[in-house]
Amino acid sequence: SGVFQLQLQEFINERGVLASGRPCEPGCRTFFRVCLKHFQAVVSPGPCTFGTVSTPVLGTNSFAVRDDSSGGGRNPLQLPFNFTWPGTFSLIIEAWHAPGDDLRPEALPPDALISKIAIQGSLAVGQNWLLDEQTSTLTRLRYSYRVICSDNYYGDNCSRLCKKRNDHFGHYVCQPDGNLSCLPGWTGEYCQQPICLSGCHEQNGYCSKPAECLCRPGWQGRLCNECIPHNGCRHGTCSTPWQCTCDEGWGGLFCDQDLNYCTHHSPCKNGATCSNSGQRSYTCTCRPGYTGVDCELELSECDSNPCRNGGSCKDQEDGYHCLCPPGYYGLHCEHSTLSCADSPCFNGGSCRERNQGANYACECPPNFTGSNCEKKVDRCTSNPCANGGQCLNRGPSRMCRCRPGFTGTYCELHVSDCARNPCAHGGTCHDLENGLMCTCPAGFSGRRCEVRTSIDACASSPCFNRATCYTDLSTDTFVCNCPYGFVGSRCEFPVGLPPSFPW
C-alpha cells in the first residue's frame, strides 16, 4: 500500500490557446486530469488501472502552482494504491480549459483540451522527487513525482506491513525495510521476550520486564542461583530446593543437633583437649596443673601435699619446694635425722625403731596422717568423688556434691535418663553414656517417638480374593473392599457359604 504523488509546479501557455490552436476566451482557465496506470511501452488510452485524480482550476494561461499540501492536499496530487508497487508505471497528464464551473468530462466540449503529455518508466519507492519538464509546440509543464509507502507499510515495494508497538505482543519499532527493531531490553522474533538481569539463571529465574530476575519456587538470590533449603534447616545447605544437607558437626532432619560441641563451643579451658562424646556432650582432658569439668581450675602443685614430715610447701613457677622442719631433709623432707628418742611422733602417734635405730616410723591414731602424724586427715585428698563430683570436708567425714546426671555416695551412679519415661507412644528407652535413645514402635518416629508416621496397614496384603485394601490413617488399621461374591472383614468368605464357627 502506498501513494503516487505528483507535484505540479509550473504551466506555461503564453498565447492562451487550446490544443486546436483556437484561443481561449477570455483566457485559458486551466485544470488538470491525471491518469496513472500500469507500464505500457506505448502509452495508450484505456482504464487508469492505478488511479485517476483531477484538480480544480489552478490558473489562467501561464501560472506557477503553489504547494498546497497543508490546505486540503491538492498539490501534490495523491494517487493511493492498495497493492505491491511494481516499480514501473505510465502517467498521462491532461491540461483542460474550463469555460464554466462544471469540470466533469461530460460537461466539457471535446476541443477544451489544452495539452496532453504521456510518460512511462521505472520508479523506485523513495522520498526523493523526480523533476520533469514536458514541452509541446505551445505549452510547457514542469512537475515532479515520487512513490512513497502508506503509513505502516515498508520495503522496496510497500508490501511489508509493520506497526510499531509496545505491549506484551511486541516491543519494537519498524526499520525502513519493514523488519522489527526491538526496543532496548527486549528480544525474540517479535521482541516480546524481556532480556532478564545479566546472569539471571536460565532455568531457575525468569522475568516479565527487562533487567528483572524473578525466582521460580525453591530458588532465591539476586540471580536465582541459590536454592532454598528445607524450612527450619538450621546448620545445613542444599544443592536442590528443600534439601537440608548438614554442615560438618551437625545432624538431625533440620541439622539442629550439635555433633561437634567441641568445635562450636570450645568449652575446654587452659589448653585442654576436647573430645566429642555424643550430642551436646564432651570430655575435657586437662593439661598438668589444671582440673575441673572444663579444666577451668588451676591446680597448685602443693595441693597434693608432697612435703613429708611436717615440711611446708612453696609453689614455684617451675614446680614446688619443700622447707623441711629440723631433723628432716630431702626433696620431700622424707629423710630423717631423728630417732624415737627424739619423740618425733605428734598427736599421740607411737614410734617404732627401724634399721637398728637409724630410722623410725610413726603409727598414727585415726584422723591423723603424715610421717610424724602431724597432718589432720583431709578426706578429700584421694579425690574419692567420681564423675567430676566435688568433695567437701565435713569434720571427721566427707561428702560428694554430684554433677547433674549422677548420684550415690561417691557420685558413682549414673542417674537413669529413662526414669522419666521420656519416650512417647510406647517407645523403648535406652540409657546411653551421655543421654538416652528411644526405639519407636511402628507408626512413630522422632527423637522421643512423638511424630506419628502412617503405617501402611495394607503392606501385609491382609485382604483375600482380590479385594481392595485401604489404610485408615486415623487408626492405622485396614479396611477390605470385597469384590462381588465375597464377605468378611478380610473378604475371606464366599457369599452363600456361611463360615464354620467353632461352637
Epitope: 506497526k163 506484551h168 505482543f169 511486541g170 516480546q192 516479565s208
Partner: antibody
Framework: EVQLQESGPGLVKPSETLSLTCTVS??????????WGWIRQPPGKGLEWIGD???????YYNPSLKSRVTISVDTSKNQFSLKLSSVTAADTAVYYC?????????????WGQGTLVTVSS | LYVLTQPPSVSVSPGQTASITCSGQ??????ASWYQQKPGQSPVLVIY???KRPSGIPERFSGSNSGDTATLTISGTQTMDEADYLC?????????FGGGTKVTVL
C-alpha cells in the same frame, strides 16, 4: 490439533470466588509464541477480555477487573486458571479460554467451547 | 479507556457484498482481528493482522485497516455467513473487543 477445555463449577454464590481451569492438549503451554487468555460473554452481549498469562507466569489484566482477577499457570499440567473474587450477578457469563498467538499479532486462533457460570444464591 | 464501535446489524442479499466497519481512535496504527460467532458456538478467527486469513477461512473474507476504521468485507455472501462478527485490537496490554455486528443474509 490444539484443544482447550474449560472446567469448573457452573454455579457460584454472590461474594464468593469463581474458579475455572483451562486444560490445553495437543500443544505445549510453555511455547514462547503464545499467551493464554480468558474472555467472557454475558448472555446476549459481546465479548469482554479478562486477562492473559505467559508460560513464565507474567500476567496482564483488564483494568476494569484487575482488583478481582488472578490468572495462574501450571506448566507441568499444561493448564492455566482463572480466579475472580467477590462475584455478583453481573459476572454471570459464558467464560472462554483461548490461545493468543504472538505471530498472529495477538489474534486468538484456538478457543475452548466455553462454560456458563451463573452467579446466584 | 479504548473503545471499538461497530454497527449493531448489517443486512445483505446472498451473493452480494457485506461490509462491516469497526472504528476506534487511530485504529489504523493497531492490528485488527475479526471473529465470527454463530449462536451457541465459540468465536472463530477469520481475519488477523488487518487483512490476513487463517488457513481454512474462505477467500471471500477480506479485511483492511487505515485511519480510524477497520473493515471486514464478505464478497459473495452466503447464507452460512449469517453470524455475529466482532473486531478486536490491543490497546497497550489490554485486549479490546467491539460490540459485535449481526450480519443477516436476506
Amino acid at each position: 490439533e490444539v484443544q482447550l477445555q474449560e472446567s469448573g463449577p457452573g454455579l457460584v454464590k454472590p461474594s464468593e470466588t469463581l474458579s475455572l481451569t483451562c486444560t490445553v492438549s495437543g500443544g505445549s503451554i510453555s511455547s514462547s509464541s503464545y499467551y493464554w487468555g480468558w474472555i467472557r460473554q454475558p448472555p446476549g452481549k459481546g465479548l469482554e477480555w479478562i486477562g492473559d498469562i505467559y508460560y513464565t507466569g507474567s500476567t496482564y489484566y483488564n483494568p476494569s477487573l484487575k482488583s478481582r482477577v488472578t490468572i495462574s499457570v501450571d506448566t507441568s499440567k499444561n493448564q492455566f486458571s482463572l480466579k475472580l473474587s467477590s462475584v455478583t450477578a453481573a459476572d454471570t457469563a459464558v467464560y472462554y479460554c483461548a490461545r493468543e498467538d504472538v505471530i498472529l499479532r495477538g489474534g486468538s486462533d484456538y478457543w475452548g467451547q466455553g462454560t456458563l457460570v451463573t452467579v446466584s444464591s | 479507556l479504548y473503545v471499538l464501535t461497530q454497527p449493531p446489524s448489517v443486512s445483505v442479499s446472498p451473493g452480494q457484498t457485506a461490509s462491516i466497519t469497526c472504528s476506534g481512535q487511530r485504529l489504523g496504527d493497531k492490528y485488527a482481528s475479526w471473529y465470527q460467532q454463530k449462536p451457541g458456538q465459540s468465536p472463530v478467527l477469520v481475519i488477523y493482522e488487518d487483512s490476513k486469513r487463517p488457513s481454512g477461512i474462505p477467500e471471500r473474507f477480506s479485511g483492511s485497516n487505515s485511519g480510524d476504521t477497520a473493515t471486514l468485507t464478505i464478497s459473495g455472501t452466503q447464507t452460512m455467513d449469517e453470524a455475529d462478527y466482532l473486531c478486536q485490537a490491543w490497546d497497550r496490554d489490554t485486549g479490546v473487543f467491539g460490540g459485535g455486528t449481526k450480519v443477516t443474509v436476506l
